[in-house]
Interface confidence: medium
Amino acid sequence: HPIPDSSPLLQFGGQVRQRYLYTDDAQQTEAHLEIREDGTVGGAADQSPESLLQLKALKPGVIQILGVKTSRFLCQRPDGALYGSLHFDPEACSFRELLLEDGYNVYQSEAHGLPLHLPGNKSPHRDPAPRGPARFLPLPGLPPALPEPPGILAPQPPDVGSSDPLSMVGPSQGRSPSYAS
């Protein structure tokens, strides 16, 4: 069992871990969660630079997940779709970390309780039935590099005045990806 990740002490006070989040759930092929540079989120069969993640505790049991290479935060839209954002929105990008007895973890959006899943073979809008939570095994990565790149752990504050704080943010600059000019 990955004892370090099971220790409740690591869920307090801004504890930072570098991990690969690996899933072998029946609904998925074996894959590591990957945050890509253009904001897409997918699964990589092998560990890749884009799948090395930094997990930082925000408060007991709640974390933010940052792609180390791409400096993008893992975030989730209300429909469950995942994306990588350049900016940290506490509502969209905070995840509750639930530790299972077998060393696996389950993650769910703190704001709307949706479980974290790798994108499946269907659009999130077209899943025939809701799936149970995906189990992820946090595999050790390299220790955090020092000094950390500026701005990664002190991101731009969210637009708390936004009329739609759960809309997709980041490279699309506050718009849903309609690809309009």
């Epitope: 092929t29 890509r36 540079e37 253009d38 904001g39 897409t40 997918g42 990589a44 290479k69 791409t70 400096s71 994306y83 350049l86 994108p119 499946g120 073979n121 659009s123 809008h125 077209r126 997709m168 980041g170 490279p171 699309s172 600059q173 990806p177 690809y179 000019s181």
Partner: antibody, heavy 117, light 106 residues
Framework: QVQLQQSGAELARPGASVKLSCKAS????????ISWVKQRTGQGLEWIGE????????YYNEKFKGKATLTADKSSSTAYMELRSLTSEDSAVYFC??????????WGQGTTLTVSS | QIVLTQSPALMSASPGERVTMTCSAG?????MYWYQQKPRSSPKPWIY???NLASGVPARFSGSGSGTSYSLTISSMEAEDAATYYC?????????FGGGTKLEIK
Amino acid sequence: QVQLQQSGAELARPGASVKLSCKASGYTFTNYGISWVKQRTGQGLEWIGEIYPRSDNTYYNEKFKGKATLTADKSSSTAYMELRSLTSEDSAVYFCTRSDYGFFDYWGQGTTLTVSS
Amino acid sequence: QIVLTQSPALMSASPGERVTMTCSAGSSVSYMYWYQQKPRSSPKPWIYLTSNLASGVPARFSGSGSGTSYSLTISSMEAEDAATYYCQQWSSNPRTFGGGTKLEIK
């Protein structure tokens, strides 16, 4: 509005190198990737690679490693692609395109490269 | 790399006719993207994330599919729809395009 303005047509000799440019305007250059796509006459589209100006990270199609080199100049919001050791197989139209969430949402007008002796 | 096979390679349709073209992936992909290209022009973004229409795309177009099978449908063919349509994936590197379906007007 978002625009990607590509450099003009190029005529090059076999074995030579060329550097194509793509000047972006109308958006924050460092917030998106720039991909390059090849299209030979009457053929389909082929992804060459991509650069993210914010980090200068590059990703290549294995087929084009050693052939293409992607760079970006943040100060002028311009992306470049250098093609080396040119052969007739490199004669094509090359497009630059902006990448947003896996989608190529804006395209340049294309640069025609002709390799001939 | 994931090979995308579009079929048919060439098709023609009369105005008002319903048109469906397919894109088959060599292995499962999460989403499909589509582009329209007319002669001597750059490709235009057409459908993203399998089923969402890009800005300015007429509502007669739709996209669907999952896994290894995706399709683009035009509910009622119009003359301006004559073009070549390409599918594209980025579930794994490298990004790949299909060979295209050329749609002509009868």
